[in-house]
C-alpha cells in the first residue's frame, strides 16, 4: 500500500507540475525600432522582439507581428506605449497629435479584426519646449482562443520611444475556460 | 485501504494549500508622504508603507525602500503614480515639466540596476489654471529571481500625491519559472 | 489497490478542477451609454455590461451599477476610462477640466466607502483643435470579502467614450487569503 | 501602387484664377503631409507650399504667399492647389510630391505626380 | 533665408566614372537636405534624405555625406540611366530650397 502510496503522491505531483507549467503562457514583447514605419496615421506594429532583454514567451507564438495564442484560456492582456519627441529630431508636421493605441483581436477562422483595447491622448506640443513626451498603458481581461491573434496598432509610430522599457505588450493566461 | 485514502486526501489537500499558498508572493506598497524628497530631480522612492490601509505584503520584503524577491517566479508588477499641484501651494519653479515613473530592478549579485518600465508625461501647468492633476499607470510581467530588489524613481518628487489610492506600487507572482 | 488508485486520481482530478474554477471569480465589465449622467461633477457609474461583447463575469455578481465579490481573495482590479469630445457636440461649458476616475469598495457589514484607486489628468481643451481625446488606466491588488462591492466613479461623464474597448473595469482572482 | 495623379492645368490670362488637384491613392493619404513644387521653363526646381497631414499647418513660399492656397480632402484623398491673381512669372510644370515623413517635415518628398501644365498668358 | 548653391551647373563624364557633386550653404545649417534626380518628361525621384540616409529602391552607388555647410551627392561609378539634373534641397524652419541643380551629362 505504501508503494501505492508513493507512485499516487509521485504521480499527482508530476501531473500537478506539468498540468500548471501547460496552463499558464505568457508573453511580454518588446518594440523592434530597426522597422517603424513612417506616417502619422494609425499603423500595426509588426517588429517586436521576442526573446532579448524583457523580452520573452512560452507557450504562445510570435509571427508576422502578431502574437498568437496557442491555448484557449482567460488572459490577462497589457500595453505600454511610449511616445517622444526632441527638437533635434526636426520639426513636428504639426503640433496637434493624436497619440493612440489599439490593442486588435483577429480571427483566422472568421476573418476579423476587433479592438479589445484603446488608449491615448491628443497632445499640444508646441516648439516652446525642447522636449515632449507621453505614454499610454492599457490592460484588461480577456478570453482567447486557440489561433486568435493580438496585434498592437498606434498613430504617429515614428514618434515611438524605442526603449525596451517603454513599447512592449504581454499576455499571460490567468485561467482555463470553463 | 480505506485509512490509507485518506491520507493521501489529507496529505495532497495539505500540499495542494500549502504549495498554492507559498507560490503566490505579493506586495502592494503605498507612499508614505513623511519622507518625500524635495527638488524636480529623479530622485528614488525609499519611503512607502507594507501594512496600513490598502499595503500589504506576503513572501516578500520590504527593506530599505526596496521590494525584494524571495521567492524564483513570473511576476506582474504595477505602479500607479499620482501628481498634483495647487496654487495655493506656491508658484512652479518652471511651467514645463517632464512627470516620470520609472520601475527598476537591482541584482545584488550582480551589483547593476536596470528599468523594468518607465512612463510619465511633458506638463504645461500653467497659472491659469488653480489646480492641476497627472497621473501615470504602468504595468508588465517579469522574470524575478530571489533576491533581486524593485523600487521606483519619480521625477518632481515633491508634487506627488500622498493618498495611498494615488501612489501605489505591487507585485504578485503568476507563475513558477520552469 | 489499483481500483482504490484509480478513484484517488479520479477524485483529486475532480478535486482540484473544481477547486481551481471556484478559485478564480473574475469580471470584465464594459460601459452601457445608454444611461450616462450628465454633468460634469464626480458621479457613480451604474450601467455597465457585464454579457456582451467583450463583457463577462464568472462567480462575481453585478447588481445595482457594483461588482459584488461572492468569494474571499486577492484580486488584480483594473480599469480602463476613456473621455473624448468633439466640436460638433457643441462648445465645452469650461476649456479646463478635470478628468477623473476612482474605484471604490463599498462594505455593507461596515456601511462604508473607500477609494481603492484613483487616476486622470487635469486638462486644456481649447477650441482651436476639433477633436480631443484622453484615457486613463488604473489597477491594483487588492484583499477583497465576499459581500464587499466595487465601483467607479468619473467627474465628466458626459464627456465618456462609449465604446467597449474604450470605457471599461474588471478583476480577476489571484489567490486565497491565507 | 503609389501614385499621385494630377488634373486642372491649362492656359489662363494674368489676374484669373485655376485650381489643381492631386488625386492620392496606394497609401494612406491621411497620414501625411502634401507639397507643390514647381519647374518654370528652362529653370530649376522651386517649392511652392505644404500642408500638414491633418490640414492644420500649411506653409507658402514667399512668391505666392497671399495668392495660393493649398487645401487637402483626406476623406477623397485629394490635394488641392487654388491659385488666384496669377501672374505671368507663374508660368510652369506644377508637381504635387508627398512627404517622405508623415510626423516630421524635413524628411524630402518620396513620391511626384507627374506634373501639369499652367501657363499665364494675355 | 538660406541660399543653396550647386556646383558644378554642368558635369561632363563618363560611364564607371566617380561623380561628386556638392550643395553648399550661405551659412550653417541642420542635415535636413535632400537629394534628387530628375530626367526630361518624368517626375523627380528622390535619393538620399537627412543627408545621408539612402531612399528605398535607390541603388547602392548612390550616397550622401556633408554637415554645416558642405553637402555632397556621390555616384560611385556612373551607370548609362544615371545622366541627369540633380537637385539638392534645404528644409528649414517651415521653407524648402532647391539648389540651381547640376546637369551630368555624357562626355
Known amino acids: 500500500i505504501r508503494a501505492e502510496k508513493a507512485m499516487v503522491d509521485g504521480s499527482w505531483l508530476d501531473l500537478a507540475k506539468r498540468s500548471k507549467l501547460e496552463a499558464q503562457p505568457f508573453a511580454h514583447l518588446t518594440i523592434n525600432a530597426t522597422d517603424i514605419p513612417s506616417g502619422s496615421h494609425k499603423v500595426s506594429l509588426s517588429s517586436w522582439y521576442h526573446d532579448r532583454g524583457w523580452a520573452k514567451i512560452s507557450n504562445m507564438t510570435f509571427s508576422n507581428g502578431k502574437l498568437i495564442v496557442n491555448q484557449d484560456g482567460f488572459y490577462y492582456l497589457y500595453a505600454n506605449i511610449c511616445f517622444r519627441h526632441h527638437e533635434t529630431s526636426g520639426d513636428l508636421a504639426t503640433e496637434y497629435l493624436q497619440l493612440m493605441v489599439y490593442v486588435t483581436k483577429t480571427s483566422i477562422k472568421i476573418p476579423s479584426s476587433h479592438t479589445l483595447m484603446k488608449g491615448g491622448s491628443t497632445k499640444y506640443w508646441s516648439g516652446n519646449s525642447e522636449f515632449h513626451f507621453y505614454s499610454i498603458n492599457v490592460g484588461g481581461f480577456f478570453k482567447l482562443r486557440s489561433g486568435e491573434e493580438i496585434s498592437i496598432e498606434v498613430s504617429n509610430p515614428s514618434l515611438l520611444d524605442p526603449d525596451q522599457d517603454a513599447t512592449y505588450f504581454g499576455a499571460f493566461k490567468v485561467r482555463d475556460i470553463d | 485501504i480505506r485509512a490509507e485514502k485518506a491520507m493521501v486526501d489529507g496529505s495532497w489537500l495539505d500540499l495542494a494549500k500549502r504549495s498554492k499558498l507559498e507560490a503566490q508572493p505579493f506586495a502592494h506598497l503605498t507612499i508614505n508622504a513623511t519622507d518625500i524628497p524635495s527638488g524636480s530631480h529623479k530622485v528614488s522612492l525609499s519611503s512607502w508603507y507594507h501594512d496600513r490601509g490598502w499595503a500589504k505584503i506576503s513572501n516578500m520584503t520590504f527593506s530599505n525602500g526596496k521590494l525584494i524577491v524571495n521567492q524564483d517566479g513570473f511576476y506582474y508588477l504595477y505602479a500607479n503614480i499620482c501628481f498634483r499641484h495647487h496654487e495655493t501651494s506656491g508658484d512652479l519653479a518652471t511651467e514645463y515639466l517632464q512627470l516620470m515613473v520609472y520601475v527598476t530592478k537591482t541584482s545584488i549579485k550582480i551589483p547593476s540596476s536596470h528599468t523594468l518600465m518607465k512612463g510619465g508625461s511633458t506638463k504645461y501647468w500653467s497659472g491659469n489654471s488653480e489646480f492641476h492633476f497627472y497621473s501615470i499607470n504602468v504595468g508588465g510581467f517579469f522574470k524575478l529571481r530571489s533576491g533581486e530588489e524593485i523600487s521606483i524613481e519619480v521625477s518632481n518628487p515633491s508634487l506627488l500625491d500622498p493618498d495611498q489610492d494615488a501612489t501605489y506600487f505591487g507585485a504578485f507572482k503568476v507563475r513558477d519559472i520552469d | 489497490i489499483r481500483a482504490e488508485k484509480a478513484m484517488v486520481d479520479g477524485s483529486w482530478l475532480d478535486l482540484a478542477k473544481r477547486s481551481k474554477l471556484e478559485a478564480q471569480p473574475f469580471a470584465h465589465l464594459t460601459i452601457n451609454a445608454t444611461d450616462i449622467p450628465s454633468g460634469s461633477h464626480k458621479v457613480s457609474l451604474s450601467s455597465w455590461y457585464h454579457d456582451r461583447g467583450w463583457a463577462k463575469i464568472s462567480n462575481m455578481t453585478f447588481s445595482n451599477g457594483k461588482l459584488i465579490v461572492n468569494q474571499d481573495g486577492f484580486y488584480y482590479l483594473y480599469a480602463n476610462i476613456c473621455f473624448r469630445h468633439h466640436e460638433t457636440s457643441g462648445d465645452l461649458a469650461t476649456e479646463y477640466l478635470q478628468l477623473m476616475v476612482y474605484v471604490t469598495k463599498t462594505s455593507i457589514k461596515i456601511p462604508s466607502s473607500h477609494t481603492l484607486m484613483k487616476g486622470g489628468s487635469t486638462k486644456y481643451w481649447s477650441g482651436n483643435s476639433e477633436f480631443h481625446f484622453y484615457s486613463i488606466n488604473v489597477g491594483g491588488f487588492f484583499k477583497l470579502r465576499s459581500g464587499e462591492e466595487i465601483s467607479i466613479e468619473v467627474s465628466n461623464p458626459s464627456l465618456l467614450d462609449p465604446d467597449q474597448d474604450a470605457t471599461y473595469f474588471g478583476a480577476f482572482k489571484v489567490r486565497d487569503i491565507d | 501602387q503609389v501614385q499621385l495623379v494630377q488634373s486642372g492645368g491649362g492656359v489662363v490670362q494674368p489676374g484669373r484664377s485655376l485650381r489643381l488637384s492631386c488625386a492620392a491613392s496606394g497609401f494612406t493619404f491621411s497620414g501625411y503631409g502634401m507639397h507643390w513644387v514647381r519647374q518654370a521653363p528652362g529653370m530649376g526646381l522651386e517649392w511652392v507650399a505644404v500642408i500638414s497631414y491633418d490640414g492644420i499647418n500649411k506653409y507658402y513660399a514667399d512668391s505666392v504667399k497671399g495668392r495660393f492656397t493649398i487645401s487637402r480632402d483626406n476623406s477623397k484623398n485629394t490635394l488641392f492647389l487654388q491659385m488666384n491673381s496669377l501672374r505671368a512669372e507663374d508660368t510652369a510644370l506644377y508637381y504635387c510630391a508627398k512627404c517622405l515623413s508623415g510626423t516630421y517635415w524635413g524628411y524630402g518628398m518620396d513620391v511626384w505626380g507627374q506634373g501639369t501644365t499652367v501657363t499665364v498668358s494675355s | 533665408a538660406i541660399q543653396m548653391t550647386q556646383s558644378p551647373s554642368t558635369l561632363s563624364a563618363s560611364v564607371g566614372d566617380r561623380v561628386t557633386i556638392t550643395c553648399r550653404a550661405s551659412q550653417s545649417i541642420s542635415s535636413w537636405l535632400a537629394w534628387y534626380q530628375l530626367k526630361p518628361g518624368k517626375a523627380p525621384k528622390l535619393?538620399?534624405?537627412?543627408?545621408?540616409s539612402l531612399e528605398s529602391g535607390v541603388p547602392s552607388r548612390f550616397g550622401g555625406s556633408g554637415s554645416g555647410t558642405e553637402f555632397t551627392l556621390t555616384i560611385s561609378s556612373l551607370q548609362p540611366d544615371d545622366f541627369a539634373t540633380y537637385y539638392c534641397q534645404h528644409y528649414n524652419s517651415y521653407s524648402w530650397t532647391f539648389g540651381q541643380g547640376t546637369k551630368v551629362e555624357i562626355k
Open positions: 535619393l538620399i534624405y537627412k543627408a545621408s
